[in-house]
């Protein structure tokens, strides 16, 4: 049975085997087409989600679709039901928390009272002044908290207590990529991890340990990538994996927060990378133990210089490393998180590509997660 499962796939009606390599090849080899059903699927970017959260204390903003203008949500008459609607619009199914925060002196958006219309937040028509003088600070999910804070050093062995959202994504029991838990159902990773194997069956996620071999595997229900961009083939290196059963959170299994839409990190901002990838370029061997390293944001202009990536780093990517080189992600780290700590940990980047590992002028290039929030929310909403 194990051999059969490894090399063959069973079609139904009539029952017969086809070679596993015919799965997800774009051809209907089973009479009912089930060999093309459980495959990596692409999902378009979709319409603009009409709510978003700002890095200014996670305050809620609402889009007026008629004018294309964004407004800050006033706390007046804001209810739990409205909070749930806002989070559902972003695809969250968990119970949100919200509080009032004072309107700051730098408030640049108009502040309006919020109401609901057919399960979408709307601005109240006769919205007068914001009497409470407060904005809505909204959290759709408790995320980005770990049991242990890492020390700031070069590269060292990591503990799952520091990074409870880190997972190993495996094909046929072999580690292929890293990934990050975003909520009980969803793991964030890189699209290029699935280039070779587009059938969902053999992909598994392992969570809750910093040792590669030692944790139970979780079945995957769906793998969703964003539509390919034929003008910028290295863009859109992002994927979402939906787990068959929701995760139970614990001290070693927890979600990381998505970034805020306006999370613009300045050069030299400290960041963290983790993974089980190669410890040296062309080193040929994964690390059995999770490794962590502190890096920093590298200016895109510097990263695109003639002695570096020569314009290949787009606005939907970001660079991170250390100016002198030597600390970087490598093969096997792909899909893992590039993390920023404010009040909570946020996944600001996804390990994507680079020339070599650790070179001084060619740092790691990461998918900029804030550029894909709209896509993530649309995928989640479609799967609610």
């Amino acid at each position: 049975k194990v051999i059969l499962d490894k090399y063959y796939f069973l079609c139904g009606q009539p029952l017969h085997f086809i070679p596993r390599k015919q799965l997800c090849d774009g051809e209907l080899d089973c009479p009912l087409g089930e060999d093309e059903e459980h495959c990596v699927k692409s999902f378009p970017e979709g319409p603009a989600v009409a709510v978003r959260l700002s890095k200014d204390r996670s305050t809620l903003q609402v889009l007026d679709s008629a004018t294309g203008n964004w407004f800050s949500a006033c706390f007046d008459n804001f209810t739990e039901a409205l909070a749930e609607t806002a989070c559902r619009q972003m695809g969250y199914s968990s119970k949100p928390t919200f509080r009032a925060v004072e309107i700051g002196p730098d408030q640049d958006l108009d502040v309006v009272e919020i109401t609901e219309n057919s399960q979408e937040l709307r601005m109240r028509n006769s919205s007068g002044p914001c009497l409470s003088g407060s904005l809505v600070s909204l959290h759709c999910l408790a995320c980005g908290k770990s049991l242990k804070t890492p020390r700031v050093v070069g590269v060292e062995e990591a503990s799952v207590d520091s990074w409870p959202w880190q997972v190993s994504i495996q094909y046929d029991k072999q580690h292929v990529c890293g990934g990050s838990i975003l909520d009980p159902h969803w793991v964030l990773t890189a699209a290029h991890c699935f280039r070779k194997h587009t059938d969902v069956f053999n992909w598994k996620v392992r969570a809750g340990s910093d040792k590669l071999g030692s944790f139970p595997s979780l079945a995957v229900a769906k793998i969703i990538i964003i539509e390919f961009n034929p003008m910028y083939p290295k863009d859109n290196d992002i994927a979402l994996m939906k787990l068959q059963f929701p995760l139970t959170f614990s001290g070693t299994v927890r979600p990381i927060c998505l970034p805020f839409f306006d999370e613009e990190l300045t050069p030299a901002t400290p960041l963290w990378i983790i993974g089980w990838g190669f410890t040296k370029q062309n080193g040929g061997k994964m690390s059995d133990i999770l490794l962590q390293a502190s890096v920093q944001v590298i200016d895109s202009t510097r990263c695109n210089a003639d002695d570096a990536y020569q314009g290949e780093v787009t606005e939907k990517m970001m660079c991170a490393g250390i100016p002198e080189g030597g600390v970087d992600t490598c093969q096997g780290d792909s899909g893992g998180p590039l993390m920023y700590q404010s009040d909570q940990w946020h996944v600001v980047g996804i390990v994507s590509w680079g020339y070599g590992c650790g070179g001084p002028s060619t740092p790691g290039v990461y998918t900029k997660v804030s550029a894909y929030l709209n896509w993530i929310y649309n995928v989640w909403k479609a799967e609610l």
Partner: antibody
């Protein structure tokens, strides 16, 4: 030097198919994406689809889905674009165009192939 | 699909003039914009990519600017060989789309 040389002009009847070729030289054929763009007489440019000559993967504009097929022959460094169920509005000059190595624009174009669809 | 509009649709200018062509996207496209020049009976030629990067071999009198929804192609001093039609193209979202073109002819 980089060259994209396309096949000659074609006259086709409505309902027929046409296959246009584009032979690449002067660079590593499998290292660059190839796209097809068409231009009806006196009109603007219309993107049709792309092909990765290395993997053979393709993607087409919704408008042409089901009617267009892009293929390649790596032994001759040639890409092909076949358009079926031709109608008079398919009369156009068809261009193959190479995507810049780092993306963002088409740096080399074929000379164009005029396809005329007429009964 | 993202719609691209160009203005003006045509313009008449003299050699030595400074010429500006604008391109507008129906939604934000960052800097994912290219400009092409096409002469009658010829294939288009890439001038600018990533909104403002000059393609190698293109004269420095051509420049591009803009980000988001509004973009500009500027020819600082029009030369006889610059009389042609100019197209913008977005590469931000599938499918790539072109503007309708701006024809620059001799005054």
């Amino acid at each position: 030097q980089v060259q994209l040389v396309q096949s000659g002009a074609e006259v086709k009847k409505p309902g027929a198919s046409v296959k246009v070729s584009c032979k690449a030289s002067g660079y590593t054929f499998t290292g660059y994406y190839m796209h097809w763009v068409r231009q009806a007489p006196g009109q603007g440019l219309e993107w049709m689809g792309w092909m990765n000559p290395n993997s053979g993967n393709t993607g087409y504009a919704q408008k042409f889905q089901g009617r267009v097929t892009m293929t390649r022959d790596t032994s001759t460094s040639t890409v092909y674009m076949e358009l079926s169920s031709l109608r008079s509005e398919d009369t156009a000059v068809y261009y193959c165009a190479r995507l810049r190595a780092k993306g963002g624009g088409f740096d080399y174009w074929g000379q164009g192939t005029l396809v005329t669809v007429s009964s | 699909d993202i719609q691209m509009t160009q203005s003006p649709s045509s313009l008449s200018a003299s050699v030595g003039d400074r010429v500006t062509i604008t391109c507008r996207a129906s939604q934000g496209i960052g800097n994912y914009l290219a400009w092409y020049q096409q002469k009658p009976g010829k294939a288009p030629k890439l001038l600018i990519y990533a909104a403002s990067s000059l393609e190698s071999g293109v004269p420095s009198r051509f420049s591009g600017s803009g980000s988001g929804t509004d973009f500009t192609l500027t020819i600082s001093s029009l030369q006889p060989e610059d009389f042609a039609t100019y197209y913008c193209q977005q590469g931000y979202r599938f499918p790539p789309t072109f503007g309708p073109g701006t024809k620059v002819d001799i005054k």
